[in-house]
């Protein structure tokens, strides 16, 4: 089978600070040395890129400085964290993995993680 399987949790609840973390694991059909991981958000039929990072196997993921994502890698497993989430960001987040090098190229698409975000209640004014 030439398909690459990607596994990710079905549901994750973001913290009260708007942070959500989940693991994206892929079954590599080959010995990849350079991997690109992309987090996509699917709303209705629209798919948008949330963040992306390319890393060499054995090294850390490097997201752009202004990215809302951070992550670490260990073998064929990537631990992803998305920050700054608000209730309106609730949705399906898909982990996409591409084995860029060496040939052949492989694409893996996860089934998506439904991330639920609940905005914290504002603190009531105190009478002190």
């Amino acid at each position: 089978c030439k398909a690459m399987h990607v596994a990710q949790p079905a549901v994750v609840l973001a913290s009260s600070r708007g942070i959500a973390s989940f693991v994206c694991e892929y079954a590599s059909p080959g010995k990849a040395t350079e991997v690109r991981v992309t987090v996509l958000r699917q709303a209705d039929s629209q798919v948008t890129e949330v963040c992306a990072a390319t890393y060499m196997m054995g090294n850390e993921l490097t997201f752009l400085d202004d990215s809302i994502c951070t992550g670490t890698s260990s073998g064929n497993q990537v631990n992803l964290t998305i920050q700054g989430l608000r209730a309106m960001d609730t949705g399906l987040y898909i982990c996409k993995v591409e084995l860029m090098y060496p040939p052949p190229y492989y694409l893996g698409i996860g089934n998506g993680t439904q991330i639920y975000v609940i905005d914290p209640e504002p603190c009531p004014d105190s009478d002190f």
């Epitope: 089978c1 030439k2 398909a3 690459m4 399987h5 059909p29 350079e34 690109r36 992309t38 996509l40 798919v47 948008t48 890129e49 992306a52 898909i94 996409k96 860029m100 090098y101 040939p103 052949p104 190229y105 492989y106 694409l107 893996g108 698409i109």
Partner: antibody
Framework: EVQLVESGGGLVKPGGSLRLSCAAS????????MHWVRQAPGKGLEWVSF????????YYADSVKGRFTISRDNAKNSLYLQMNSLRAEDTAVYYC???????????WGQGTMVTVSS | EIVLTQSPATLSVSPGERATLSCRAS???????LAWYQQKPGQAPRLLIY???SRATGIPDRFSGSGSGTDFTLTISRLEPEDFAVYYC?????????FGQGTKVEIK
């Protein structure tokens, strides 16, 4: 408007060279992989070449390996295909196509005709 | 290389009828990585179905895809005049990216 527009096709003699261009607009070009696909007259679709987001990784069909070179300029939102040592069997309409976020080729140009004949 | 074989090569159908197109892969293709395209004469291909069964944006619901592993199907439930065209399947899960040879759907 989200679109791809190819240019650079034409008539060239066997052994000659041609450079195709594909101008992208209406989307963040650097966030997508890109491909060239060709179609010989009356025939089916044949994938030709792939280039990664930053242009670091390139793949080619065996039929063009060593003769064609794919490249991109993200600052100019442009994709290129340098075709050398052209053969009669390279005669085709050449399409540039965007590799969608989920993988399929979700946006195609209108195509540019390349004819290799003496 | 994954070879995709489409059948039949030509399908003659009357408008309003159902059309069923087949695509068979030489080895297993994950269902997330199989697409169908429509091409009309003188035009570029247009994405219809991706992930074996998901309709692309703007594609009418008379088009549906199914299948997994090595056998995939594109079904057009009621053929409209504008549906007469050539249809290609494609796998995009690994390089080299490959297309089937196409099925021409013509008016009976």
């Amino acid at each position: 408007e989200v679109q791809l527009v190819e240019s650079g096709g034409g008539l060239v003699k066997p052994g000659g060279s041609l450079r195709l261009s594909c101008a992208a607009s209406g989307f963040t070009f650097s966030s997508y992989t890109m491909h060239w696909v060709r179609q010989a007259p009356g025939k089916g679709l044949e994938w030709v070449s792939f280039i990664s987001y930053d242009g670091n990784y390139k793949y080619y069909a065996d039929s063009v390996k060593g003769r064609f070179t794919i490249s991109r300029d993200n600052a100019k939102n442009s994709l290129y295909l340098q075709m050398n040592s052209l053969r009669a069997e390279d005669t085709a309409v050449y399409y540039c196509a965007r590799g969608g976020h989920l993988g399929p080729f979700d946006l195609w140009g209108q195509g540019t005709m390349v004819t290799v004949s003496s | 290389e994954i070879v995709l074989t489409q059948s039949p090569a030509t399908l003659s159908v009357s408008p309003g009828e159902r059309a069923t197109l087949s695509c068979r892969a030489s080895q297993s293709v994950g269902s997330s990585y199989l697409a169908w395209y429509q091409q009309k004469p003188g035009q570029a291909p247009r994405l219809l179905i991706y992930g074996a069964s998901s309709r692309a944006t703007g594609i009418p619901d008379r088009f549906s895809g199914s299948g997994s592993g090595t056998d995939f199907t594109l079904t057009i439930s009621r053929l409209e005049p504008e549906d007469f065209a050539v249809y290609y399947c494609q796998q995009y899960g690994s390089s080299p990216w490959t297309f089937g040879q196409g099925t021409k759907v013509e008016i009976k």
